[in-house]
Interface confidence: low
């Protein structure tokens, strides 16, 4: 799916109103570990693609995410503000219907959130730096900053 | 318990540069951006800029975009601030500070500040 | 950058009074219909101390006495009855436009 069109500013409210709280819930209850963020995005329909992958396809070790509810409330709000997008996911519903429902919250399942986490973030840093101007292409003003 | 550590206080030559570093604990340092801010005497508070450690990306006031350096060490969970080409103008109380874990923009997390002195 | 004039730049009352700090932002500061619009408290020898966020947000372990209002660029600090300890300076803060920006901050003092 392309994320081009999305309304990126219906999305950050989404996300800030209760996507953001539904993951720091999931994380709640962790050790103090790090994590390596092995994951980044440089752009706003990137940053979709790449949290798109991370909520919605199962991995060996983590296959229950598209379960839980920040990845319900992810997918009504791309449903919502991405055009089309519902009509690309039906295959996706299938497959996540077979995945399997872990009862424990493995420290894998903790990484891939953990990497969600930062990719939202950088959606949300890269939101409003590029109003009314297409993405920028130059490093040095594809500051992970700001912002709101 | 989450925490930020500075470094202590430092006495500089107008012209010289200022390393002050900020330690985190009890939290997973590499999914926060970490910012600085200074406040001289008697004076408000002003942004220099911010890091995410996760990828090493930084955002700079452009006041300080030229004399700043923001970097990181995810091994010993340190976010560091070098000052260069100091003047005296530069003396204030340097703070690192953690931004939000939701992406909002405040900061729920201060460090102690580190009291940087300029004088000749 | 966006100028965050804060006034009165000092205010004397007594405790048990109501204070209303204001902080004027010289652009919007609101976004997808939310204000990026922080409050901080700082006391003498202390780093800042979130108060609110977004506006009208308790920070943790905030006291119900203190409470926010605004959007776009006027925003209010309302404390309903002032504390011994509430006695410090008052920060606001907008993060909205890069770069980050706080206003000059309101001592508020004893009268």
């Known amino acids: 799916y392309d994320f081009t069109n999305c309304d990126f500013q219906k999305i950050e409210a989404d996300y800030l109103r209760t996507i953001s709280k539904d993951l720091i819930t999931y994380m709640s209850g962790t050790k103090s570990t790090d994590f390596n963020n092995t994951v980044s995005c440089s752009n706003r329909p990137h940053c979709l693609t790449e949290i798109q992958s991370l909520t919605f396809n199962p991995t060996p070790r983590c296959a229950s995410l598209a379960k839980e509810m920040f990845a319900r409330k992810t997918k009504a709000t791309l449903a919502l503000w991405c055009p089309g997008y519902s009509e690309t996911q039906i295959n996706a519903t299938q497959a996540m219907k077979k995945a399997r429902k872990s009862k424990v919250t493995t420290n894998k399942c903790l990484e891939q959130v953990s990497q969600l986490l930062g990719l939202w973030r950088r959606f949300i840093r890269t939101l409003l730096k590029q109003q009314g101007s297409s993405d920028y292409k130059d490093d040095d003003d594809k500051h992970h900053h700001h912002h709101h | 318990e989450a925490q930020l550590v500075q470094s202590g206080a430092e006495v500089k030559k107008p012209g010289s540069s200022v390393k002050v570093s900020c330690k985190a604990s009890?939290?997973?340092?590499?999914?926060?951006?970490m910012h600085w801010v200074r406040q001289a005497p008697g004076q408000g508070l002003e942004w220099i800029g911010a890091i995410y450690p996760g990828n090493g990306e930084t955002s700079y006031n452009q006041k300080f975009k030229d004399r700043a350096t923001l970097t990181v060490d995810k091994s010993t969970r340190t976010a560091y601030m070098e000052l260069s080409s100091l003047r005296s103008e530069d003396t204030a109380v340097y703070y690192c500070?953690?931004?939000?874990?939701?992406?909002?923009?405040?900061?729920?997390?201060w460090g102690q500040g580190t009291t940087v002195t300029v004088s000749s | 950058d966006i100028v965050l004039t804060q006034s009165p730049a000092t205010l004397s009352l007594s405790p048990g009074e109501r204070a209303t700090l204001s902080c004027r932002a010289s652009e919007s500061v609101d976004s997808s219909g939310l204000s990026f619009m922080h409050w901080y408290q700082q006391k003498p020898g202390q780093p800042p101390r979130l108060l609110l966020y977004r506006a009208s947000n308790l920070g943790s372990g905030i006291p119900a006495r203190f409470s926010g209002s605004g959007s776009g660029t006027d925003f209010t600090l309302t404390i309903s009855s002032l504390e011994p300890e509430d006695f410090a300076v008052y920060y606001c803060?907008?993060?909205?436009?890069?770069?980050?920006?706080f206003g000059q901050g309101t001592k508020l003092e004893i009268k």
């Open positions: 500070a953690r931004e939000d874990d939701y992406g909002e923009g405040y900061f729920d997390v």
């Open positions: 803060q907008q993060i909205n436009t890069d770069p980050l920006t």
């Open positions: 009890g939290f997973t340092f590499s999914t926060y951006n």
